[in-house]
Amino acid sequence: APVLPGEDSKDVAAPHSQPLTSSERIDKHIRYILDGISALRKETCNRSNMCESSKEALAENNLNLPKMAEKDGCFQSGFNEDTCLVKIITGLLEFEVYLEYLQNRFESSEEQARAVQMSTKVLIQFLQKKAKNLDAITTPEPTTNASLLTKLQAQNQWLQDMTTHLILRSFKEFLQSSLRALRQM
């Protein structure tokens, strides 16, 4: 099974080596999740032609996937550490329902899908410890998530393939933006 960063032998602190700082641990965690997403996308691309679809064609969807915008304070122009951290955590919490949807979408990469989901939960916990303004973080309503999940699972096969591809691509771009921003903090 895929291991979380810090669980494999490479990450065990060698004698006299410095333990990872909170920021380094978060950085490493995001890179680990991105590796997992990339592995999942390989399976998706091998079984459907979604990866060849243009970004514009894929944009014609009803998914409300989290995305970084200028107002979120994560871009260098208008950078705001507190606002940005809230956006990253809120976005990750919003992605959780979509990561749950992915759990039954993979055959050979089932464990990888689980690892991405679990390490995202751990990442959220790390970031919540770092955040000062926890009150500003809105958690999605469980009932809303449940009905969204039901709706996504009721789609036909082609739409489910499209949804899977879109979730993975959007999650990748959200994490890349988050990593760039976190390295400025």
């Epitope: 995001i30 890179r31 991105l34 990339s38 996308r41 691309c45 990866c51 060849e52 970004k55 970084m68 871009f75 260098q76 122009s77 950078f79 691509r169 990748k172 771009e173 890349q176 933006s177 990593l179 760039r180 390295r183 400025q184």
Partner: antibody, heavy 127, light 111 residues
């Protein structure tokens, strides 16, 4: 040693689509976290980044060229391609393909450093 | 019209030190350590010298060094040699998922 070679017609008529292919040797475009870029240079002018296709097959384009540009890849042939539609004489340039993605570029989505380049191919847009 | 601003031409003396500047904004050069520098000798392909603002690429002599302050990046060439006569380009990642080049600086090395 990674080598890149551009190929395609040297002359394209205005309003037509310019199509170029970059063949990569000495390394697979489907392995490691590299991305593959297109850059052009009009005669006597500077370099202009056009777009990139990353390890996952995701594409990103220069905003002002986005509506006319398409980059795709064929991993079985170890090639990636550029299509530029509705060309005008202003699109006359030497077109380069290049490899990008040193360091943490994949994780950050920052493909600004191109370490291996093709020799370039001159494309003239003229009737 | 290049997004990053470089002086179009500069000249330096053999053996001396010269610095080429590259001015951008908080959306590109200021957005992180995502700056590279290229050397293009007449009639040849651009060659990567520096990536990540300061990291010299393998095989590039330590006479070449890169730095950054706020929205301005710099390439410094010390101990100028005649073979350094070329056009130098800076490039940077630009938010979001974009790359921009400078207009290029043609360097002439004087005896």
């Amino acid at each position: 040693e990674v080598q890149l070679q551009e190929s395609g017609p040297g002359l394209v008529k205005p309003s037509q689509t310019l199509s170029l292919t970059c063949t990569v040797s000495g390394g697979s475009i489907a392995t490691s976290y590299y991305a593959w870029s297109w850059i052009r240079q009009p005669p006597g002018k500077g370099l202009e980044w056009m777009g990139v296709i990353d390890y996952d097959g995701d594409t990103y384009y220069k905003p002002s060229l986005k509506s006319r540009t398409s980059i795709s890849r064929d991993t079985s042939k170890n090639q990636f391609s550029l299509q530029l539609s509705s060309v005008t004489p202003e699109d006359t340039a030497v077109y380069y393909c290049a490899r990008a993605g040193l360091g943490d570029s994949y994780y950050l989505g920052t493909y600004y450093a191109m370490d291996y380049w093709g020799k370039g191919t001159l494309v003239t847009v003229s009737s | 019209q290049a997004v990053l601003t470089q002086p179009p031409s500069m000249s330096g003396t053999l053996g001396k030190t010269l610095t080429i500047s590259c001015n951008g904004t908080s959306s590109d050069i200021g957005s992180g350590n995502y700056v590279s520098w290229y050397q293009q000798l007449p009639g040849t392909t651009p060659k990567l010298l520096i990536e990540g603002v300061t990291t010299r690429v393998s095989g590039i002599p330590d006479r070449f060094s890169g730095s950054k302050s706020d929205n301005t990046a710099s390439l410094t060439i010390s101990g100028l040699q005649s073979e350094d006569e070329a056009t130098y380009y800076c490039a940077s990642y630009r938010e979001t998922n974009n790359v921009v080049f400078g207009g290029g600086t043609h360097l002439t090395v004087l005896g």
